[in-house]
C-alpha cells in the first residue's frame, strides 16, 4: 500500500483583510491513525494554528466534518484575516502514540494578505505663520499591504512637488505605513485654501483616499491700519476712525491712545468678511477738541491673535 501523502494543492492564497481564508489539505490514506495539526511557519518556532484533537481555536473552523472516521479532508477556514496572519501554513499528519509523533507534512500554502491603507491624516504646524513663510504639513497612512503605494500632495487642486515620502519598514513586513512631509509657501489669499494628501493603493476600488488640512488653521494674516480724521460732527468734536483691514483670524483687540494715554479698548466683534476669507473692522473715536489746548497725537494700537501690537498714529491739529 502506498504511503500516506499530505496534499496542500495551493502553493499560495491571497485574501483581503477582514475576509476568511480557506487553506486546503487532504491526505491520501487513513493509515497511520493519528491527528492532523496546522502550523504557521516551520521549525521549532512554528505556531500552532489548529489541532484536530484538542484546544480552542475560535477563528478556525474545519471545512468538512473532520471528526468522521473516513474523513480525508482537513481543510480549514480562518476568519477575519489581518495582515498579521500572513505566512506559510503547513498541514501536518501525526502518528498516534504517547506522545503523538510527526509523520508527514504538506508542502505548505503561503497566505498573503492585502489590506487597505487607513484614511490619510494630515497635520499642519503647531503655530500659525504669516504669508511668504514656508510651513510643513505631514501626512500619514497605516496598515496597508502590499508595500507599493503612491502619495501625492495638492494645494487647491494644484499638485505640489516639494515633499519627501517614506514607506516603513524598508524590509519585508506584514503591513506598512507611509509618512510624507510637504512644504507649502503661504500667501495672503490662503485663508480658504486646502492642502490635500492623496493616497492610491491596489486595494482601493474607489478613488484615492484623501486627507485634508485647511490653511485657515495655519495662516495668520496681519492687519493693515489706516487712521483718518472725519469732518467735524459738532463744533468741538472730531471723529477719528481706524480702519483695520485684511486680517485673519478674527481675534483682535484695539486700543485708542490720546497722547500716549489709553482712551478706550475694544475687541473686534461686528467684522465684515472679505471674499478671500480675511476680515475688515472699523473703530472710531470721538475727540472733544475743546478739552485740549495743544495738538493731539491719536494712536490706534492693534493686538492681533496674541502677536506684538502694531499701531498707526494721527496728529490732530487744535487751532487756537
Amino acid at each position: 500500500e502506498e504511503e500516506l501523502q499530505v496534499i496542500q494543492p495551493d502553493k499560495s492564497v491571497s485574501v483581503a483583510a477582514g475576509e476568511s481564508a480557506i487553506l486546503h489539505c487532504t491526505v491520501t490514506s487513513l493509515i497511520p491513525v493519528g491527528p492532523i495539526q496546522w502550523f504557521r511557519g516551520a521549525g521549532p518556532a512554528r505556531e500552532l494554528i489548529y489541532n484536530q484533537k484538542e484546544g480552542h481555536f475560535p477563528r478556525v473552523t474545519t471545512v468538512s466534518e473532520s471528526t468522521k472516521r473516513e474523513n480525508m479532508d482537513f481543510s480549514i477556514s480562518i476568519s477575519n484575516i489581518t495582515p498579521a496572519d500572513a505566512g506559510t501554513y503547513y498541514c501536518v499528519k501525526f502518528r498516534k502514540g504517547s506522545p503523538d509523533t510527526e509523520f508527514k507534512s504538506g508542502a505548505g500554502t503561503e497566505l498573503s494578505v492585502r489590506a487597505k491603507p487607513s484614511a490619510p491624516v494630515v497635520s499642519g504646524p503647531a503655530a500659525r505663520a504669516t504669508p511668504q513663510h514656508t510651513v510643513s504639513f505631514t501626512c500619514e497612512s497605516h496598515g496597508f499591504s502590499p508595500r507599493d503605494i503612491t502619495l501625492k500632495w495638492f494645494k487647491n487642486g494644484n499638485e505640489l512637488s516639494d515633499f519627501q515620502t517614506n514607506v516603513d519598514p524598508v524590509g519585508e513586513s506584514v503591513s506598512y505605513s507611509i509618512h510624507s512631509t510637504a512644504k507649502v509657501v503661504l500667501t495672503r489669499e490662503d485663508v480658504h485654501s486646502q492642502v490635500i494628501c492623496e493616497v492610491a493603493h491596489v486595494t482601493l476600488q474607489g478613488d484615492p483616499l484623501r486627507g485634508t488640512a485647511n490653511l485657515s488653521e495655519t495662516i495668520r494674516v496681519p492687519p493693515t491700519l489706516e487712521v483718518t480724521q472725519q469732518p467735524v460732527r459738532a463744533e468741538n468734536q472730531v471723529n477719528v476712525t481706524c480702519q483695520v483691514r485684511k486680517f485673519y483670524p478674527q481675534r483682535l483687540q484695539l486700543t485708542w491712545l490720546e497722547n500716549g494715554n489709553v482712551s478706550r479698548t475694544e475687541t473686534a466683534s461686528t467684522v465684515t468678511e472679505n471674499k478671500d476669507g480675511t476680515y475688515n473692522w472699523m473703530s472710531w473715536l470721538l475727540v472733544n477738541v475743546s478739552a485740549h489746548r495743544d495738538d493731539v497725537k491719536l494712536t490706534c494700537q492693534v493686538e492681533h491673535d496674541g502677536q506684538p501690537a502694531v499701531s498707526k498714529s494721527h496728529d490732530l491739529k487744535v487751532s487756537a
Epitope: K11, S12, S14, V15, A16, S112, R114, P146, D148, I149, T150, A200, H201, V202, T203, L204, Q205, G206, D207
Partner: antibody, heavy 116, light 109 residues
Framework: VQLVESGGRLVQPGTPLTLSCTVS????????MGWFRQAPGKGLEYIGI?????SPYYASWVNGRFTISKTSTTMDLKMNSLRSEDTATYFC?????????????WGPGTLVTVSS | DIQMTQSPSSLSASVGDRVTITCRAS??????LAWYQQKPGKAPKLLIY???FLYSGVPSRFSGSGSGTDFTLTISSLQPEDFATYYC???????????FGQGTKVEIK
C-alpha cells in the same frame, strides 16, 4: 455575477456610438469597472476604467475621444467620431475583489464595425 | 507607458507537454501581473493574478511565477481544452494603468 455588453453595430465613420455594460449579481458602487477592445485577429487593448465612486480614468491614447460613465446598474462607453480603426469587439470587465490589478469577470463582448 | 513583450507569439505542442510562456515588462511592475486565456469568439478568462496566485476554479496545472520585469506562465501537462491564446496583463501602481502583452497562440502540433 454577470456582465453583458450591448449597443455594438455597423456605423459609418464620423458617427458617435454609445455602448452599455449591464451588470447583475453585484453593485457597481463597490467595484472598479473597465472597458477593453480587440480588433479582429489582434490582441487586447485597455480603454479605461471607472472607479466605484464614479471617476473615470483613461488609457493615454484615448485623448478625449471616449467617455466612460455609469448609473446604478450600467456602465457606458460613449465614443465620438468613430474611425475604421475603432472596428473591434468591445468588452467590459470587473476588477477582482482583492484589488484593481486584475479583472476576474468579463462580458461576452459586443462587435462594433466602422465602415462606409 | 509600460510595454509588455510576450514570447513566443505562437507555439505548437502536444497533449501532455509542458508549456512555458514568458512576459517581460519594460520597467518593474513588482508582482502586478495577470494571465488570461482566450478562445476564439469568447471573452478572456482569468488564470493567474498577482504573478503567482491561481484564480478560483482554474486547474492546478497552470502556474505563474516571476516579479519585477520577468514573468512566466507554465502549463505542466497540456490538455486538449488548453489550446487557446494566452495574454499577460500588467498594472502599474504609479500610473495606475493597464497594458497587455501581444498574446501567445498555443496550437496543436
Amino acid at each position: 455575477v454577470q456582465l453583458v455588453e450591448s449597443g455594438g453595430r455597423l456605423v459609418q465613420p464620423g458617427t458617435p456610438l454609445t455602448l452599455s455594460c449591464t451588470v447583475s449579481g453585484f453593485s457597481l458602487s463597490s467595484y472598479v469597472m473597465g472597458w477593453f477592445r480587440q480588433a479582429p485577429g489582434k490582441g487586447l487593448e485597455y480603454i479605461g476604467i471607472i472607479s466605484s465612486s464614479g471617476s473615470p480614468y483613461y488609457a493615454s491614447w484615448v485623448n478625449g475621444r471616449f467617455t466612460i460613465s455609469k448609473t446604478s446598474t450600467t456602465m457606458d462607453l460613449k465614443m465620438n467620431s468613430l474611425r475604421s480603426e475603432d472596428t473591434a469587439t468591445y468588452f467590459c470587465a470587473r476588477v477582482g475583489p482583492l484589488g484593481v490589478d486584475y479583472f476576474n469577470i468579463w462580458g461576452p463582448g459586443t462587435l462594433v464595425t466602422v465602415s462606409s | 507607458d509600460i510595454q509588455m513583450t510576450q514570447s513566443p507569439s505562437s507555439l505548437s505542442a502536444s497533449v501532455g507537454d509542458r508549456v512555458t510562456i514568458t512576459c517581460r515588462a519594460s520597467q518593474s511592475i513588482n508582482s502586478y501581473l495577470a494571465w488570461y486565456q482566450q478562445k476564439p469568439g469568447k471573452a478572456p478568462k482569468l488564470l493567474i493574478y498577482s504573478a503567482s496566485f491561481l484564480y478560483s476554479g482554474v486547474p492546478s496545472r497552470f502556474s505563474g511565477s516571476g516579479s519585477g520585469t520577468d514573468f512566466t506562465l507554465t502549463i505542466s501537462s497540456l490538455q486538449p481544452e488548453d489550446f487557446a491564446t494566452y495574454y499577460c496583463q500588467s498594472w502599474h501602481y504609479i500610473s495606475r494603468s493597464y497594458t497587455f502583452g501581444q498574446g501567445t497562440k498555443v496550437e496543436i502540433k
